[in-house]
Interface confidence: medium
């Protein structure tokens, strides 16, 4: 990268993204790395990380989750169905990643990097998918009202929401990573 061309640290224009399976694999690991930093700050700030899974399950968040029918698990694996699920799930996570943007103090930059890296990952995966018609994009109006609702919660709920988003996103990406390695 020539001196002075490192603005905002988005990849320099000459670097064409490599869209091989390895590239996608590395992109996911990069995002997971960012998530672990955000989780570190969240866990240091609140005791959410110690809360039992059962207690945290009692929430009204509709976070994307892998199910048997999605074809991403070893039993009943279906490449096309699974890829559609991964892309759809990532698109659904975008509103939650937007919510995370104002939730961090020392890791503000990391939150941004996770959000931007996820957008890039979606692009990589869309190039890989053959059946783009099956991918449903979330409704912007619904997303906007969901964002407003999340931001209006009290401090404790916002802390819990942040923790849940990070945990669910991490689990979703880990499942996606395992599935993509079979493709």
């Amino acid at each position: 990268v020539p001196p002075g061309e490192d603005s905002k640290d988005v990849a320099a224009p000459h670097r064409q993204p490599l869209t091989s399976s390895e590239r996608i694999d590395k992109q996911i690991r990069y995002i997971l790395d960012g998530i672990s930093a955000l989780r570190k700050e969240t866990c240091n700030k609140s005791n959410m990380c110690e809360s039992s899974k059962e207690a945290l399950a009692e929430n009204n968040l509709n976070l994307p989750k892998m199910a048997e029918k999605d074809g991403c698990f070893q039993s009943g694996f279906n490449e096309e169905t699974c890829l559609v699920k991964i892309i759809t799930g990532l698109l659904e996570f975008e509103v939650y990643l937007e919510y995370l943007q104002n939730r961090f103090e020392s890791s503000e930059e990391q939150a941004r990097a996770v959000q931007m890296s996820t957008k890039v990952l979606i692009q990589f995966l869309q190039k890989k998918a053959k059946n783009l018609d099956a991918i449903t994009t979330p409704d912007p109006t619904t997303n906007a009202s969901l964002l407003t609702k999340l931001q209006a919660q009290n401090q404790w709920l916002q802390d819990m929401t942040t923790h849940l988003i990070l945990r669910s996103f991490k689990e979703f990406l880990q499942s996606s990573l395992r599935a993509l390695r079979q493709m």
Epitope: S20, Y30, D33
Partner: antibody, heavy 123, light 104 residues
């Protein structure tokens, strides 16, 4: 302008310790994976250790595992290499390099290198 | 661990020649390979990343190819300033590793 400046090298006796530092500027340090590479006199390049951007996950060459520790301080834009139980075969120029950077993961190619700091292990 | 075997270890060529350096990986590394040039007394410089992508500012006479286990760096039309040692690096899986170098 991207700059990587290593310091902390010097002459040390076998079994001794040194801490190398690499001051980074001209880019958002916290977004980049960083790596130490070394080069023994008249020899080739040897990958020593890498550290992830955010989580601080690390990896080491077998030759330094258990003796060297890579770390970073994103607030200070600084990369470190703590070298303990030094051996004569650790004598080399140590380079700090930037890799796998920015929001788009492209490759681990090391696009910027510091000038290097000399470490000499001798009695 | 992945080993990289670089050949030849040294080579002599004339100005204008087409020069080929190869790097063989002990297992598949996809296209996760980069090439570096190190001139005497200087720090290494990235030439090629992702096996075949030319880094900005690197002359077009340099090119990289290959995937899996076999990779090639080609200099078409050797120039005096290309006198250097060339290294390949696999960054597919930790521990990363360099080839032993080719002195030109």
């Amino acid at each position: 302008q991207v700059q990587l400046v290593e310091s902390g090298g010097g002459l040390v006796q076998p079994g001794g310790s040194l801490r190398l530092s690499c001051a980074a500027s001209g880019f958002t340090f916290s977004n980049y994976y960083m790596t130490w590479v070394r080069q023994a006199p008249g020899k080739g390049l040897e990958w020593v250790s890498s550290i992830y951007s955010f989580s601080g996950d690390t990896a080491y060459a077998d030759s330094v595992k258990g003796r060297f520790t890579i770390s970073r301080d994103n607030a200070k834009n600084t990369l470190y290499l703590q070298m303990n139980s030094l051996k004569s075969e650790d004598t080399a120029v140590y380079y700090c390099t930037r890799n796998l950077g920015g929001v788009v993961v492209t490759t681990n190619g090391y696009d910027y290198w510091g000038q290097g700091t000399q470490v000499t292990v001798s009695s | 661990d992945i080993q990289l075997t670089q050949s030849p270890s040294s080579l002599s060529a004339s100005l204008g020649d087409r020069v080929t350096i190869t790097c063989q990986a002990s297992q598949s590394i996809s296209t996760e390979l980069s090439w570096y040039q190190q001139k005497p007394g200087q720090t290494p410089k990235l030439l090629i990343y992702g096996a075949s992508r030319l880094q900005t500012g690197v002359p077009a006479r340099f090119s990289g190819s290959g995937s899996g286990t076999s990779f090639t760096l080609t200099i078409s039309g050797l120039e005096a300033e290309d006198l250097a040692t060339y290294y390949c690096l696999q960054d597919y899986s930790w521990p990363y590793s360099f080839g032993s170098g080719t002195r030109l």
